[in-house]
């Protein structure tokens, strides 16, 4: 969490941003809140990006003002206009690109004063893994697949019964480039698995960590997946 104070001495307002990550090709949110004002027409929101000459987005006098918007953000940004009055200056970003990564500044002016806070935005690709029993294999084998990752992640297998065991000798991981030539499909195979055990396939890069669990017993198979973004800290 980054909390920024106003830059005009005693006329300062608190602006709060949260570092976040965007998934390439999907929509992202750059989060920013501020001390609200009672009049929408008195609120100015400016989003800026380090190294970019034009604005990312500007909202003032109750409407968007995009004449100074940088070309790379054209048609891709929107504030939640109905939530500005309650102090929400968050920005919606359409179709996140790798090049959207960087340092953003949320700059606010109200009748109470000015304030700003920076936000680190990471971009990459991350997706839920799915673990299945591979019945085509000669021995009991598990197959962990996740459709979209970037940068290339690490894949580690673990099991509830053999805690701390190193499965690198009995697993094989491959990365297949997807059609857009950026993200990759992750496939990891674990051999010689035993029943009545829970196995976890953990995929991680510097943006996200995802886990796919599978519990195989004589009578049933249970699956569970979990994804968590890393380094989501507020300013």
């Amino acid at each position: 969490l980054i909390i920024g104070f106003g830059i005009s001495g005693r006329h300062s307002i608190t602006v709060t941003t949260v570092a976040s990550a965007g998934n390439i090709g999907e929509d992202g949110i750059l989060s920013c809140t501020f001390e609200p004002d009672i009049k929408l027409s008195d609120i100015v929101i400016q989003w800026l990006k380090e190294g970019v000459i034009g604005l990312v987005h500007e909202f003032k006098e109750g409407k968007d003002e995009l004449s100074e918007q940088d070309e790379m953000f054209r048609g891709r940004t929107a504030v939640f206009a109905d939530q500005v009055i309650v102090g929400n200056a968050s920005l919606r970003l359409k179709n996140v690109q790798l090049t959207d990564a960087g340092t953003y500044k949320c700059y606010i002016i109200t009748s109470k004063g000015k304030g700003n806070a920076n936000l680190e935005y990471k971009t990459g690709a991350f997706s839920m893994p799915e673990v299945n029993v591979d019945y085509n294999a000669s021995s009991e084998t598990l197959r962990c697949e996740a459709p979209r990752w970037f940068p290339q992640p690490t894949v580690v297998w673990a099991s509830q019964v053999d805690q701390g065991a190193n499965f690198s000798e009995v697993s094989n991981t491959s990365f297949e480039l997807n059609s857009e030539n950026v993200t990759m499909k992750v496939v990891s195979v674990l051999y010689n698995v035993t029943i009545n055990n829970t196995y976890s396939c953990m995929i991680e890069n510097d943006i996200a960590k995802a886990t796919g669990d599978i519990k195989v017993t004589e009578s049933e198979i249970k699956r569970r997946s979990h994804l968590q973004l890393l380094n989501s800290k507020a300013s």
């Epitope: 090709g25 999907e26 929509d27 034009g54 987005h57 409407k63 968007d64 003002e65 995009l66 004449s67 100074e68 918007q69 940088d70 070309e71 054209r74 048609g75 891709r76 940004t77 929107a78 919606r92 359409k94 179709n95």
Partner: antibody, heavy 119, light 107 residues
Framework: QIQLKESGPGLVQPSQSLSITCTVS????????VHWVRQSPGKGLEWLGV???????DYNSAFISRLSISKDNSKSQVFFKMNSLQADDTAIYYC?????????????WGQGTLVTVSA | IIVMTQSPKSMSMSVGERITLNCKAS??????VSWYQQKPEQSPKLLIY???NRYTGVPDHFTGSGSATDFTLTISSVQAEDLADYHC?????????FGSGTKLEIK
């Protein structure tokens, strides 16, 4: 309320150019992009291009060599020019505005101007 | 170029019937699909944006759903005034593209 209105020539000679003006009211051209879409007789809709608030343009690659879109913010007017028209460019030409600043759907359309390409 | 394929090309329905119009994108377009109704001699009217959001003033018997490549527009109980062409379009990537339309006729 928000309105867009196209004004065009109606008839264009083959190989000549087409100029249409879209005059908007109820919103500012510095807040929203304006798109151009056409519909040939009995056919579907075809997106031609857009001019954004900052003056940047994006064109359908099939028309990029003969299409130009510009605007005058102070007059709330957008100008569409297409060169080298042929018979298959006969269509109703619309200007349209998106629902938000992110292009999610064209909520506002002009009434359209029918352009016939014929000698 | 993303191709939007609409089906069926036309359909004839009785008042009160439930119908589903389909739109398939040739590649992932997220939820950036909108649906339009166009009556004879009129401009298209936005019904649904963002795949499932009903536009202001659109009757609630129109419902949109879907994501990625498969989208549907459902009319839960067809009214006589629903006689029109219906178009889907994607605004995910350039060039923005539309389907060829579905003509709805009332029996």
């Amino acid at each position: 309320q928000i309105q867009l209105k196209e004004s065009g020539p109606g008839l264009v000679q083959p190989s000549q150019s087409l100029s249409i003006t879209c005059t908007v009211s109820g919103f500012s051209l510095t807040s929203y992009g304006v798109h151009w879409v056409r519909q040939s007789p009995g056919k579907g809709l075809e997106w031609l291009g857009v001019i954004w608030s900052g003056g940047y343009t994006d064109y359908n690659s099939a028309f990029i060599s003969r299409l130009s879109i510009s605007k005058d913010n102070s007059k709330s007017q957008v100008f569409f020019k297409m060169n080298s028209l042929q018979a298959d460019d006969t269509a109703i030409y619309y200007c349209a505005r998106d629902i938000t600043t992110i292009v999610e759907g064209f909520a506002y359309w002009g009434q359209g101007t029918l352009v016939t390409v014929s000698a | 170029i993303i191709v939007m394929t609409q089906s069926p090309k036309s359909m004839s329905m009785s008042v009160g019937e439930r119908i589903t119009l389909n739109c398939k994108a040739s590649e992932n377009v997220g939820t950036y699909v909108s649906w339009y109704q166009q009556k004879p001699e009129q401009s298209p009217k936005l019904l649904i944006y963002g795949a499932s959001n009903r536009y202001t003033g659109v009757p609630d018997h129109f419902t949109g759903s879907g994501s990625a490549t498969d989208f549907t527009l459902t009319i839960s109980s067809v009214q006589a005034e629903d006689l029109a062409d219906y178009h889907c379009g994607q605004t995910y990537s350039y060039p923005f593209t539309f389907g060829s339309g579905t003509k709805l006729e009332i029996k």
